[in-house]
């Protein structure tokens, strides 16, 4: 009598998440009786994964109808695969008893699950940094298998070097998420710059997926602030100017004290952006000479973006002040100055 | 599903060629396609890819002489001065559905013979 | 590039018995690799990919195995419509490249 043998003819079986998966097996004799299993894994912890007889399977059915007289396949199909059912399948032959006993098992077939990365989300820092300042970008994506990723990091289309990325788990699992570092060193150009993750995976058709990150979020850009002095006017009143620079974002409160008082406060708002993304600011302040008798103390305070306060002083000299200026005069641009205008 | 290459012909040298793949069954906008050649009696030879959305990938030989880009429902190889060397079968393939790194539909080959 | 060495170039064997096909990667592949059928004037034909998946269709005498650089096709049962060309084609996932071996005749006597 020939032996009954209990044949898996794939070694391995490939298929993508959410796909169906066929597991073959035939047995190569009807005798002895009893029946067919299937498990996922082998030894004593092996999970049932089907049985004519009992149980509920709702995911995996029979390819041909074993109920049919002389029935010798014993394939299945599992439905709506995930990487969580992927494992090696085994077909085992049992002799009718009470209980049954395993009498032959197939050589196994390995299911790999392929699965697609999820699209890669890109987070920036909590705070902004001003230009010169390193900022760390983090992208993150899960979910795939196999293992096999690249992740690339760009910067306006310019690869970057300074990257720490790692694959987790490090040994086997079903699944896998990528998690990678890039660090960036601002400039006061970076406003409009944009900070690319790339991933790629053999389960892509030929492009990488892309998670995309814009400085304009990680970046503050402080203003450069000059004070300058417009020609008198024929009433005695002097036109200051206070303009504010290069700043980024928008959010700037402009504050003008005259010798220590707050004389008026005004919001950035609305303002036309320049070629690189930044804000310049403009803001006048008149002032009557002829009602004071003293030097006036003239201060431009900028706080821009919950930042300390920047000022620009200067002091404006009443006595003997001439009826005409011949040119602008303008407060250094650096810190807190103080400068006689007359 | 089908893949069908065009335009193989006796040329000159210096010539330049473009090769069609036209696909019936499937999108082009789906899949990965590549091409690839086989001179008489030799093995084959990767050239290059398309991706889904139409990024075109080469191997390093072809250092610019061959362009592949793409329509809705074919592959274009653009061959500039074909040189003796090139003359082969020429093959598109598709690659397959769980990744890209097979290729389990392939075109029957339409021969280029570049000669004086 | 990686290059795809394959042996032997030439093989043959009797209906019945068996071939070994050896294709070794000039660095690991991860599995990434495929074998094709080719019959003089017919365009390749998938038998396996992801070195041991057996692609829907073909018969099951056709297996695959191996790892990292060095990979095997076996052929057992040998039928004379086996007699044909087999090439062992990679794909790097850091490359993105592909590349073939030099293939290896089968004649089946």
């Known amino acids: 009598e020939e032996e009954l043998q209990v044949i898996q003819p794939e070694k391995s079986v490939s298929v993508a998440a959410g796909d169906s998966a066929t597991l073959n097996c035939t047995v190569s004799s009807l005798i002895p009786v009893g029946p067919i299993q299937w498990f996922r894994g082998a030894g004593p912890g092996r999970e049932l994964i089907y049985n004519l007889k009992e149980g509920h399977f709702p995911r995996v059915t029979p390819v041909s109808d074993p109920t049919k007289r002389n029935n010798m396949d014993f394939s299945i199909r599992i439905s709506n695969i995930t990487p969580a059912d992927a494992g090696t399948y085994y077909c085992v032959k049992f002799r009718k008893g009470s209980p049954d006993v395993e009498l032959k098992s197939g050589a196994g077939t390995e299911l790999s699950v392929r699965a697609k990365p999820s699209a890669p989300v890109v987070s920036g820092p909590a705070v902004r940094a001003t230009a010169e300042h390193t900022v760390s970008f983090t992208c993150e994506s899960h979910g795939f298998s196999p293992r096999d990723i690249t992740l690339k990091w760009f910067k306006n289309g310019n690869e970057l070097s300074d990257v720490q990325t790692n694959v987790d788990p490090a040994g086997k699992s079903v699944s896998y998420s990528i998690r990678s570092t890039a660090r960036v060193v601002l400039t006061r150009r970076d406003v409009h710059s944009q900070v690319i993750c790339e991933v790629a995976h053999v389960t892509l058709q030929g492009d990488p997926l892309r998670g995309t990150a814009n400085l304009s979020e990680a970046i503050r850009v402080p203003p450069f602030l000059e004070v300058t002095q417009q020609s008198m006017r024929a009433d005695n009143q002097v036109n200051v100017t206070c303009q504010v620079t290069k700043f980024y974002p928008q959010r700037l409160q402009l504050t003008w004290l005259e010798n220590g008082n707050v004389s008026r406060t005004e919001m950035a708002s609305a303002l036309p952006e320049n070629k690189d993304g930044t804000y310049n600011w403009t803001s006048w302040l008149l002032v009557n000479v002829s009602a004071h008798r003293d030097d006036v103390k003239l201060t431009c305070q900028v706080e821009h973006d919950g930042q300390p306060a920047v000022n620009k002083s200067f002091s404006v000299k009443v006595s003997a002040h001439p009826k005409e200026q011949g040119s602008n005069t303008a407060a250094e641009n650096t810190g807190t100055n103080e400068r006689n205008i007359y | 599903v089908q893949l069908v290459e065009s335009g193989g012909r006796l040329v000159q040298p210096g010539t330049p060629l473009t090769l069609s793949c036209t696909v019936s069954?499937?999108?082009?906008?789906?899949?990965?396609m590549g091409w690839f050649r086989q001179a008489p009696g030799k093995g084959l030879e990767y050239i290059g890819i398309i991706s889904s959305s139409g990024s075109p990938y080469y191997a390093s030989w072809v250092n610019g002489r061959f362009t592949i880009s793409k329509t809705s429902t074919t592959m274009d190889l653009k061959m500039n001065s074909l040189r003796s060397e090139d003359t082969a079968t020429y093959f598109c393939a598709r690659v397959g559905p769980l990744g890209v790194d097979y290729f389990n539909i392939w075109g029957p080959g339409t021969l280029v013979t570049v000669s004086s | 590039d990686i290059v795809m060495t394959q042996t032997p170039s030439s093989v043959e064997a009797a209906v019945g018995g068996t071939v070994t096909i050896k294709c070794q990667a000039g660095?690991?592949?991860?599995?990434?690799l495929a074998w094709y059928q080719q019959k003089p004037g017919q365009r390749p034909k998938l038998l396996i990919y992801?070195?041991?998946t057996l692609e829907s269709g073909v018969p099951s005498r056709f297996k695959g195995s191996g790892s990292g650089t060095d990979y095997t096709l076996t052929i057992s049962d040998l039928e004379s419509a086996d007699a044909a060309t087999y090439y062992c084609q990679s794909w790097h996932y850091i490359s993105r490249s592909y590349a073939f071996g030099g293939g290896t005749e089968v004649v089946v006597k």
């Open positions: 069954g499937f999108s082009l906008s789906s899949y990965v």
């Open positions: 660095q690991s592949i991860n599995s990434y």
């Open positions: 992801y070195a041991s």
